[in-house]
Interface confidence: low
């Protein structure tokens, strides 16, 4: 697959567009909606039939430096009796997000956009059974 | 990427903060060469809290197409394939960063934007409120 390019040519370029060197783009990392908060149902990671834990990954050369990853607690799912049912599977649900990566090259710094795959939580699924001939 | 001179104290001093505005390469790097190892999953359909995916398109944003999950049921699917309303299907939401064209319509000038997306659904035990 091709590496995606962000710049699009189909836009009529307004006069007010800032000058940008070829092959690069200007990125303001002051985040729009910075103070928006997730209004997820309370403690769903513990109440789910496919519960998960969170781990915070930290990288000072990444913006944002903190990225939270979920890990499913069980291979199976939790049944009504609170026991693990291995006839069902807990599976991770993933979502891509963008981060800015800072790279040091000698006394210079460069910035690169990077896609990061985040595990957001888990869901309980019926397994796919492969029958051996 | 595009190189930017570091502060005069280089190489001893290290600037801990990111500048407010940076120049970045147009190519998006992805260290996981396979963009999404779960590409071929059909969890949306096999889940006990199944969901549909709805297309949200905005040419002023990168990525321009984002998919929103909507839980199909209020309850969860039980072993008999019926909806069990003693359990709840709830969306799993995630804040992600996207690029917003700023000023609008400019091809190579962006600002980071945080948006909330529903990625999928999970089945949870409901919180029961007892009325006194």
């Amino acid at each position: 697959r091709k590496i995606p390019k962000v710049g699009h040519t189909f836009f009529q370029k307004p006069e007010s567009c800032p000058p940008v060197p070829g092959g690069s783009m200007k990125l303001d990392i002051g985040i729009i909606n910075e103070n928006q908060r997730v209004s997820m149902s309370r403690n769903i990671e513990s109440r789910s039939t496919s519960p998960w834990n969170y781990t915070v990954t930290w990288d000072p050369n990444r913006y944002p430096s903190e990225v939270v990853q979920a890990q499913c607690r069980n291979l199976g799912c939790i049944n009504a009796q609170g026991k693990e049912d291995i006839s069902m599977n807990s599976v991770p649900i993933q979502q891509e997000t963008l981060v800015v990566r800072r790279k040091h090259q000698g006394c210079s710094v460069s910035f690169q956009l990077e896609k990061v795959l985040v595990t957001v939580g888990c869901t309980c699924v019926t397994p796919v059974i492969h029958h051996v001939q | 990427g595009i190189t930017i001179p570091r502060n005069p104290g280089c190489p001893n001093s290290e600037d801990k903060n990111f500048p407010r505005t940076v120049m970045v390469n147009l190519n998006i790097h992805n260290r996981n060469t396979n963009t999404n190892p779960k590409r071929s999953s059909d969890y949306y359909n096999r889940s006990t809290s199944p969901w549909n995916l709805h297309r949200n398109e905005d040419p002023e944003r990168y990525p321009s197409v984002i998919w929103e999950a909507k839980c199909r049921h209020l309850g969860c699917i039980n072993a008999d394939g019926n909806v069990d309303y003693h359990m709840n299907s709830v969306p799993i939401q995630q804040e992600i960063l996207v690029l917003r064209r700023e000023p609008p319509h400019c091809p190579n000038s962006f600002r980071l934007e945080k948006i909330l997306v529903s990625v999928g659904c999970t089945c949870v035990t409901p919180i029961v409120h007892h009325v006194a």
């Epitope: - | 999953s41 059909d42 949306y44 359909n45 549909n52 995916l53 709805h54 297309r55």
Partner: nanobody, 125 residues
């Protein structure tokens, strides 16, 4: 397993219309997003249109948008491609495909697990 059978392809004059059908049998039809692809002689197979399992999401490639319409009738287990204002460059074998995955992209051929045998559409000038 899902079996797909296309029909409706024929010779038609430029500017004319056609409706292709894709009948599905096998596992639950409604659980599959469906797509149409086409392959002209000597060219690679290319994405034409797709529809989500609920039918409320559709996607088209630029060169057919506004001329072609994809729809599905789950009661009949059939997907349709209604083609209008046909051009000679629309001449190709049209394939119906079903996918077991759904991650927000419609146009990657690799994501489609089940394919029909194809139906020939020829547009004469």
């Amino acid at each position: 397993e899902v079996q797909l059978v296309e029909s409706g392809g024929r010779l038609v004059q430029a500017g004319g219309s056609l409706r292709l059908s894709c009948a599905a049998s096998g596992r639950t039809f409604t659980s599959y997003p469906m797509g149409w692809f086409r392959q002209a002689p000597g060219k690679e197979r290319e994405f034409v249109a797709a529809i989500s399992m609920s039918g409320d999401d559709t996607a088209y490639t630029d060169f057919v948008r506004g001329r072609f319409t994809i729809s599905r009738d789950d009661a009949r287990n059939t997907v349709y491609l209604h083609m209008t204002s046909l051009k000679p460059e629309d001449t190709a074998v049209y394939y119906c495909a079903a996918r077991t995955s759904y991650d927000g992209t419609y146009d990657y051929i690799d994501d489609y697990s089940y394919w029909g045998q194809g139906t020939q559409v020829t547009v004469s000038s």
